[in-house]
Amino acid sequence: QAAPFPELCSYTWEAVDTKNNVLYKINICGSVDIVQCGPSSAVCMHDLKTRTYHSVGDSVLRSATRSLLEFNTTVSCDQQGTNHRVQSSIAFLCGKTLGTPEFVTATECVHYFEWRTTAACKKDIFKANKEVPCYVFDEELRKHDLNPLIKLSGAYLVDDSDPDTSLFINVCRDIDTLRDPGSQLRACPPGTAACLVRGHQAFDVGQPRDGLKLVRKDRLVLSYVREEAGKLDFCDGHSPAVTITFVCPSERREGTIPKLTAKSNCRYEIEWITEYACHRDYLESKTCSLSGEQQDVSIDLTPLAQSGGSSYISDGKEYLFYLNVCGETEIQFCNKKQAAVCQVKKSDTSQVKAAGRYHNQTLRYSDGDLTLIYFGGDECSSGFQRMSVINFECNKTAGNDGKGTPVFTGEVDCTYFFTWDTEYACVKEKED
């Protein structure tokens, strides 16, 4: 049986059950190669409390559909008195990066995971030439996820004192020059994740081969190497390589751009101070407030919730968008879709799509940007579920009693973008 998601095959992936202090290793095409789980384990569970390992999915006992992967075992378990076998179940959804498997829940018999990934899309529009896992769990099993930094088009310009060259990088995947052919990037070779531009020439100085690595609690490392054997004539016989060190800052701050810290013989060392390198609990909340123990800021958007069936309305030329954030009030137009953002076609109001659901909510404050994300909306033709990204700006003089109103700014591949100026986005630093 052929591997159902070949682009996920090259790596062993990790997922975590934080509540129970369990680390899962997942290899969907082979075995995880952990001796304690046996030679054919595809899903190996490491219980850090008891320091024990159990195979909860066997690579030989795999069954697959387009969106579901199941690994059975021969180990019996008891579920409501019936004799079942322990198994792992991975549900796949279309995403814009390789993504990460997320632990959902576990019963006595079944370990459930969900994975939003380009590998599950019906069309190849989000697929990279080369992409590597872009997240890590630290020793406390807290997730550090750089997926939000991955550019689907274009690249980051590295801050460098050399006026004659420009070094462009992407994070964890190659630079897509076709979707956004900026004049400088157009000459970059396909597959490169680090492109050096000198005049009208561009050179591949690194491609991703290994996934993201954790080297200290607050430091992540990503390495790119040039795959082709041919040496570049300005590298003094050395093979080019790029090392990017992502540093979680010691306190809240605005985002910075990646900086070149060392260069010799085409070996480039880059340091990027960004809060995306911090653990996810520091950056995100599933509610509309960020003020827990983990975060050192105080943000509360719950006053933006609309009651009594009314919604915010944002005009998007062909469409009207109805928004009801930070609550579970049904939008009237979007009957029973549990939508936080509802897209209605002006010319045919019966054409209604959920552009993100209220129970699929993430509030994120990172590198000075406050963003509310609603995902899991109705599917587009690519298989990607519509989502909405609302970027908030602090405005102490916002209208509508300080609440302000959302403004639609555009759509890219079924992701809808809004900006929202409101006094409730004014971030308060927490007192020490």
């Epitope: 790596y11 062993t12 990790e14 290793k25 290899n27 995880v32 190669d33 952990i34 001796v35 304690q36 890590v136 769990f137 630290d138 020793e139 081969r209 290994d210 996934g211 993201l212 690595k213 954790l214 080297v215 200290r216 490392v221 390495s223 790119y224 190497v225």
Partner: nanobody, 124 residues
Amino acid sequence: QVQLQESGGGLVQAGGSLRLSCAASGRTFSNYDMGWFRQAPGAEREFVAYLSWSGGTTYYADSVKGRVTISRDNAKNTVYLQINSLKPEDTAVYYCAAGSAIVRITTTRDYHYWGQGTQVTVSS
């Protein structure tokens, strides 16, 4: 299973060099990430160097950066640690370790296979 056997340790003067070797047998060596750790008497085992299976990622502890190089020869199933400008504080038992798909590269628990160690003593 993977078996690891270190060699190349010994007594050396401060400022000298050593090349430690770690020979692997068993499973396909080229699939494994490799690390070197060391343990001085009465101290915890500490990370020294890491090399990914692909050779694409190397990483060194700050205490040895610039003096140490990790490399591998997949044809010989061997990983090496070249240590230059040795200091008395480099005295320790040096361990070679292997693991599959290592993410936390300085964490001992992520390496599932360990050698017995080779003693390095640096005299002043």
